[in-house]
């Protein structure tokens, strides 16, 4: 068994998945609390199956071919909090099978063949918080009379056959407050008026319902924080009309998702009943534009318009959403043009995500981002080339995070496009094809903490003594992986005294570059996948003063020429990450052997 179950945390957490086991191995300690036991073979479970493991708090029995759960199966498991029975073809659950775990909070009965809620022995589940019943054959949500709904927070019925919901059905859930109720994929065809007006919901999900009129009519007088009415590509559903959305006037909703639907008509009054709405997700709703002067969206704080068909940013008619703080337009189907001042009316905007849009701009981004003076997060990653002038982001002086990853940048040297960003903390420049010889590139970033330069190459593969990093003395995290580096000057990082995380992986560095880290202490240092073979004794103190080091995937020498390092390695195993992949390359007889297993005797 020692070769089989994996110990994740001594005496506490074990993974015994997919081992063909038909009982609990004797060598599993009694103190086990967290057990992953899925994909084994337990056709019948009873009061002796797990009786030894009285400390269990989490038990995953997914797809163990369980048919029968007998009386008092979990009688001694008072601490059991999560029980996962997903994917077991249950024929019988004894009335007392769940009597022991008084603190059971999360019960998963997904894909267990249940067709009637009477099947579940519920009377002891006073503390149940979430019940997952997806992918079964349930047609009525009528629970037994004694169903304890008081603490219930999540009730998931997705992908069942619930076509009608009555007031009577919902009465058993009246005690639940802030319940998240999921009917996704049920093709609900009718809701009795008033069924949902007896309690306040955290979220209601009717995703994939072909006829939304049924939902809007049935939810009159209801209150929910979030209403998910999205659909899916393969569902043939009715277009949303303005008239249909009038149903929202009779309910209280803060967050609404309509993804993948089509609108038959969008006019200035389409969203007039959305006056209380704070979040609206219109992902993939085939929109080409939104009309100006739309009523009802004054309080909207978050808007998602991803995967649509806009030609230009002005077509979203941003003036409709004066209170907006978060705007996401990702993966537009067409090449998206930023236009001039298209978002200028969004003076409260804090987060703007324009990634994956094929955006191209020769003079970015002052005119395009005009008046976004409160913007804190800007994502322009995965776009086409952007030309950045000096102070390209001067309209966004409050920026704290700027993500330009995988967007080729054309920078007007020798100035810095970032020089007015006095609050910028995170800058992602992964694979931006930067001219790293421009020493002013990062000037004017006094509080930059996290800099990702992955995939940007340095001239001659060298970071010299004078380099673009000297202006960012506040850096704590520096990522220089895959930068084609061959060497780093001993003084290259001398102005970076605050660093706690340095990633130099996937380069071609030799041990000489370790000298550049001599002034740093207690850092996480990733040197994986470089060209390090022998590490001389004089460099070992530099490694010793760091907290975690990764030297995996280097062509390490395991001969007596490297004995000082090999000895140091074994003494410092607690500091080393990736030791399974830290192997010898030389001599040929030891190639592939883990460093920790090497035993050398050197005269």
């Amino acid at each position: 068994w020692d070769q089989m179950c994996i110990e994740k945390e001594a005496n506490k957490t074990y993974n015994c998945e997919n081992l063909g086991l038909s009982e609990i191995p004797d060598t599993l300690p009694n103190t086990t609390e967290f057990l992953e036991f899925s994909f084994n073979f337990l056709p019948t479970i009873h009061n002796r199956t797990f009786s030894r493991l009285m400390n269990l708090t989490f038990l995953d029995l997914t797809r163990c071919q369980i048919n029968w759960i007998h009386e008092d199966t979990f009688q001694s498991h008072h601490q059991l909090s999560t029980l996962v029975l997903t994917g077991n073809p249950l024929i019988f659950m004894a009335e007392t099978s769940l009597n022991g775990p008084k603190s059971l909070k999360h019960l998963f009965l997904i894909q267990t063949g249940i067709s009637n809620l009477e099947f579940i022995p519920v009377h002891n589940l006073e503390n149940l918080e979430s019940l997952y019943l997806g992918s079964n054959h349930i047609s009525s949500i009528k629970f037994p009379k004694d169903f304890p709904a008081r603490n219930l927070k999540v009730l998931d019925f997705q992908n069942n056959a619930i076509h009608y919901i009555s007031r009577e059905d919902m009465r058993s859930l009246e005690q639940a407050i802030n319940l998240s109720l999921n009917f996704n994929g049920n093709n609900v065809k009718g809701i009795e008026l008033g069924a949902f007006d007896s309690t306040i919901f955290q979220s209601l999900n009717f995703g994939g319902t072909p006829n939304l009129s049924v939902i809007f009519n049935g939810l009159q007088n209801s209150t929910t924080q979030s209403l998910w009415l999205g659909t899916f590509e393969d569902i043939d559903d009715e277009d949303i009309s303005s008239a249909m959305l009038k149903g929202l006037c009779e309910m209280s909703v803060e967050s609404l998702n309509l993804q993948e639907h089509r609108f038959s008509d969008i006019s200035s009054t389409t969203f007039q009943c959305f006056t209380q709405l704070q979040e609206l997700d219109l992902t993939a709703t085939h929109l080409k534009g939104l009309p100006s002067g739309m009523k009802g969206l004054n309080l909207l704080k978050k808007l998602v318009l991803s995967v649509n068909h806009f030609d230009q940013l002005c077509q979203i008619s941003a003036a409709n959403f004066p209170s907006l703080t978060h705007l996401y337009i990702r993966g537009n189907v067409k090449k998206l043009h930023l236009g001039v001042g298209c978002l200028e009316k969004l003076g409260n905007l804090q987060t703007l995500d324009l990634s994956h849009n094929d955006i191209e701009a020769s003079d970015c981004c002052s005119l395009q981002l005009k008046n976004l003076s409160h913007l804190q997060t800007l994502n322009l990653s995965h776009n086409e080339p952007l030309g950045l002038q000096s102070q390209a982001f001067k309209e966004c002086p409050q920026l704290e995070l700027l993500d330009l990853a995988f967007t080729r940048l054309h920078i007007n040297a020798p100035q810095s496009p970032f020089q007015n960003l006095h609050f910028l903390q995170v800058l992602n420049l992964t694979y931006c094809f930067l001219d790293t010889s421009n020493q002013h590139l990062l000037a004017g970033l006094p509080v930059l903490r996290h800099l990702n330069l992955k995939g940007n190459h340095f001239q001659d593969g060298t970071i010299t003594k004078t380099n673009l990093l000297q202006t960012v003395g506040s850096l704590e995290v520096l990522i220089l992986s895959s930068c084609g580096l061959l060497s780093i000057d001993q003084q290259a990082f001398h102005s970076l005294g605050k660093m706690s995380h340095v990633d130099l992986s996937h380069n071609s560095l030799t041990c000489d570059s370790i000298d550049s880290l001599s002034h740093l202490k207690g850092i996480y240092l990733n040197l994986a996948a470089n060209s390090i073979n022998i590490i001389s004794p004089r460099l070992l103190p530099i490694l010793s003063q760091q907290s975690t080091i990764n030297l995996s995937h280097n062509p390490l020498d395991c001969t007596c020429s490297n004995i000082h390092f090999l000895t140091w390695y074994k003494e410092n195993l607690h500091k080393l990450e990736g030791s399974e992949e830290t192997t010898c390359a030389n001599p040929p007889s030891l190639r592939g052997v883990k460093l920790s297993d090497v035993k050398l005797s050197c005269g």
Epitope: D311, Q315, G341, G387, Q389, A413
Partner: antibody, heavy 118, light 107 residues
Framework: EVQLQQSGPELVKPGASMKISCKAS????????MNWVKQSHGKTLEWIGL????????SYNQKFKDKATLTVDKSSSTAYMELLSLTSEDSAIYYC???????????WGQGTTLTVSS | DIQMTQSPASLSASVGETVTITCRAS??????LAWYQQKQGKSPQLLVY???TLAEGVPSRFSVSGSGTQFSLRINSLQPEDFGTYYC?????????FGGGTKLEIK
């Protein structure tokens, strides 16, 4: 067919102001920014500034910041440039020109000749 | 401001000849360059954008090269309708500026 039709030639006295118009047709007027370009006699072209007809946002060449004022009338798909405090230096042909992504000019008006003379 | 310098300022050539006009930017402008042709008494017309792409309807005898600071426009087998003045223009930052123009005349 995209067309930019400019107003006719003007003769004005020094110190006066005048307004040139540019009527757009054949495309969505609010979907493209409108630029103005000056060509002095026998000289090169100079970019004056631009306006986004959708929202009225403008950007000027610093050199013309106090000389030109750009406006639009969406209802008639017309862009205007008003030139202030005219001197003989302002005598030139003025063009309106459309661009889509704040870059190059794909369609030009026929030009308006302005002569400033007492 | 970025200065654009064109050369030559003027040249004479015969129908059927090949000519080359060059444009130099005072700073690196990558491929953010357009070329225009202007005939006497007419407005300019877009010939080339993004330094390399011929505008719609421009004949293939026009070819372009260059990026960074040095660009050229070459016209093979000159036709009578090719005579006029040619301008380059950058769109890398504001203000967008034009070259001084190259006047191409019939010899």
């Amino acid at each position: 067919e995209v067309q930019l039709q400019q107003s006719g030639p003007e003769l004005v006295k020094p110190g006066a102001s005048m307004k040139i118009s540019c009527k757009a047709s054949g495309y969505s007027f609010t979907g493209y920014t409108m630029n103005w370009v000056k060509q002095s006699h026998g000289k090169t072209l100079e970019w004056i500034g631009l306006i986004n007809p959708y929202n009225g946002v403008t950007s000027y060449n610093q050199k013309f910041k106090d000389k030109a004022t750009l406006t639009v009338d969406k209802s008639s798909s017309t862009a205007y440039m008003e030139l202030l405090s005219l001197t003989s230096e302002d005598s030139a042909i003025y063009y309106c020109a459309r661009d889509y992504n704040y870059d190059y000019f794909d369609y030009w008006g026929q030009g308006t000749t302005l002569t400033v003379s007492s | 401001d970025i200065q654009m310098t064109q050369s030559p300022a003027s040249l004479s050539a015969s129908v059927g000849e090949t000519v080359t006009i060059t444009c130099r930017a005072s700073e690196k402008i990558y491929s953010y360059l357009a070329w225009y042709q202007q005939k006497q008494g007419k407005s300019p017309q877009l010939l080339v954008y993004n330094a390399k792409t011929l505008a719609e309807g421009v004949p293939s005898r026009f070819s372009v090269s260059g990026s960074g600071t040095q660009f050229s426009l070459r016209i093979n087998s000159l036709q009578p309708e090719d005579f006029g003045t040619y301008y380059c223009q950058h769109h890398f930052g504001s203000p967008r500026t034009f070259g001084g123009g190259t006047k191409l005349e019939i010899k």
